[in-house]
C-alpha cells in the first residue's frame, strides 16, 4: 500500500481555437479495473470540476456529451483535451486520479497544469 | 451556503437496526463523496464509510463491515446509513461529512447520537 | 491500513505561546491526502488544513501545516484563547480513512 503519484505538465498553452491537450499520468499502486479521472479548476483557493469520467482499464474514458472534455486512456495515462477554452479560462487545471475499484480506494492528485488561453485577434476588414 | 443535517439517531437495543439519514442542500450533492465518520463518547474520530458520486461505489471501516449499508439519493440530495446487529462499542455520535473535490472533508453536520444500550 | 500517531497527547500552554503539533504515518501519505481538523467540545469538527500546507477558507494564517512523506506538523504561531481545543490529523488518499487519536490543547 504506497500513495498514488500523479503527474502532469506545469504549462500548455491553448491553441487559437481554443483548445489545450495534456497529459496525466499516474503510478497506481493497485491494480484497479474501474478509475475515474476528473479535471478540476483551483482560481484563488475556489475548486471547480471541468468535467469527469469513469472508464474501466483496458477501455476508453467516456466524458458526458455536454462535456468540454475528450479523452483517450493508455494503461496508466490519460490524454485530456479541453475545449472552447478562452482567454477568462486560463488558469490552473489540475488532474485528480481515483482508483474506484476493487479495494482499497487511491486517490491521486497532480500538481496542475498552467493552461494559458489567448484569444484571436479578429481578422480587420479588407479593403479592396 | 453548505448545509448537513442529520436525524434518525436514538437510543436502541443491542442486535437491533437504525438508519441515519443527511439532508444535503447549497452544492451539487452528486459530484461529491459523501462519507460518514462517528465519535465514540470522550474518544476520537473514527471514519465509517463512503458513497461515491453515483452510488455506486462504497467503502467501509472493518469495524462495521458487513453489518453497515451506506447509500444515497441524488434526485433527494440524501445520504443513508443502515446500521444492523448494533454493539454497545456502536455508541457514539454519528456525523455525516462531504467530501471536497481535492479529497479533504470541508463541511460537517451537527451530528446525531446513537447510543445502543439493553 | 495507515496508522496515524500524534504527539503529545496533551499540550499545555498559554495564550500568545507557539504550539507545534506532530503527526506521524505508518507508511507514506500523499501530502495532497492530508488534513488537520479542530474540535472543541460538543462540536462537529472543523477544518483547517488540506493539502498538508493549505489552509481552508476562512482560517486565521496563525494556523500552518507543514511536511511531506510520514511527518507532518501543524504550527500555531500565537495561541488565542478559542485555540484551545482538540486537534486531528487524517489521511484521505488510501481507503480505509484514518484519523490521529488527537492531541489536546490547553490552558496552562
Known amino acids: 500500500c504506497k500513495a498514488m503519484h500523479v503527474a502532469q505538465p506545469a504549462v500548455v498553452l491553448a491553441s487559437s481555437r481554443g483548445i489545450a491537450s495534456f497529459v496525466c499520468e499516474y503510478a497506481s499502486p493497485g491494480k484497479a479495473t474501474e478509475v475515474r479521472v476528473t479535471v478540476l479548476r483551483q482560481a484563488d483557493s475556489q475548486v471547480t470540476e471541468v468535467c469527469a469520467a469513469t472508464y474501466m482499464m483496458g477501455n476508453e474514458l467516456t466524458f458526458l456529451d455536454d462535456s468540454i472534455c475528450t479523452g483517450t486512456s493508455s494503461g496508466n495515462q490519460v490524454n485530456l483535451t479541453i475545449q472552447g477554452l478562452r482567454a477568462m479560462d486560463t488558469g490552473l487545471y489540475i488532474c485528480k486520479v481515483e482508483l474506484m475499484y476493487p479495494p482499497p480506494y487511491y486517490l491521486g492528485i497532480g500538481n496542475g497544469t498552467q493552461i494559458y488561453v489567448i484569444d484571436p485577434e479578429p481578422c480587420p476588414d479588407s479593403d479592396f | 451556503q453548505v448545509q448537513l443535517v442529520e436525524s434518525g439517531g436514538g437510543v436502541v437495543q443491542p442486535g437491533r437496526s437504525l438508519r441515519l439519514s443527511c439532508a444535503a442542500s447549497?452544492?451539487?450533492?452528486?459530484?461529491?463523496?459523501m462519507h460518514w465518520v462517528r465519535q465514540a463518547p470522550g474518544k476520537g474520530l473514527e471514519w465509517v464509510a463512503v458513497t461515491w458520486y453515483d452510488g455506486s461505489n462504497k467503502h467501509y471501516a472493518d469495524s462495521v463491515k458487513g453489518r453497515a449499508t451506506i447509500s444515497r439519493d441524488n434526485s433527494k440530495n440524501t445520504l443513508y446509513l443502515q446500521m444492523n446487529s448494533l454493539r454497545a462499542e456502536d455508541t457514539a455520535v454519528y456525523y455525516c461529512?462531504?467530501?471536497?473535490?481535492?479529497?479533504?472533508?470541508?463541511?460537517w453536520g451537527q451530528g446525531t447520537l446513537v447510543t445502543v444500550s439493553s | 491500513e495507515i496508522v496515524l500517531t500524534q504527539s503529545p497527547g496533551t499540550l499545555s500552554l498559554s495564550p500568545g505561546e507557539r504550539a507545534t503539533l506532530s503527526c506521524r504515518a505508518s507508511?507514506?501519505?500523499?501530502?495532497?491526502?492530508l488534513a488537520w481538523y479542530q474540535q472543541k467540545p460538543g462540536q462537529a469538527p472543523r477544518l483547517l488544513i488540506y493539502g498538508a500546507s493549505s489552509r481552508a477558507t476562512g482560517i486565521p494564517d496563525r494556523f500552518s501545516g507543514s511536511g511531506s512523506g510520514t511527518d507532518f506538523t501543524l504550527t500555531i504561531s500565537r495561541l488565542e484563547p478559542e485555540d484551545f481545543a482538540v486537534y486531528y490529523c487524517q489521511q484521505y488518499g488510501i481507503s480505509p480513512f484514518t484519523f490521529g487519536p488527537g492531541t489536546k490543547v490547553d490552558i496552562k
Open positions: 461529512t462531504r467530501g471536497e473535490l481535492l479529497g479533504h472533508f470541508d463541511y
Open positions: 447549497g452544492f451539487t450533492f452528486s459530484s461529491h463523496g
Open positions: 507508511q507514506s501519505v500523499s501530502s495532497s491526502c
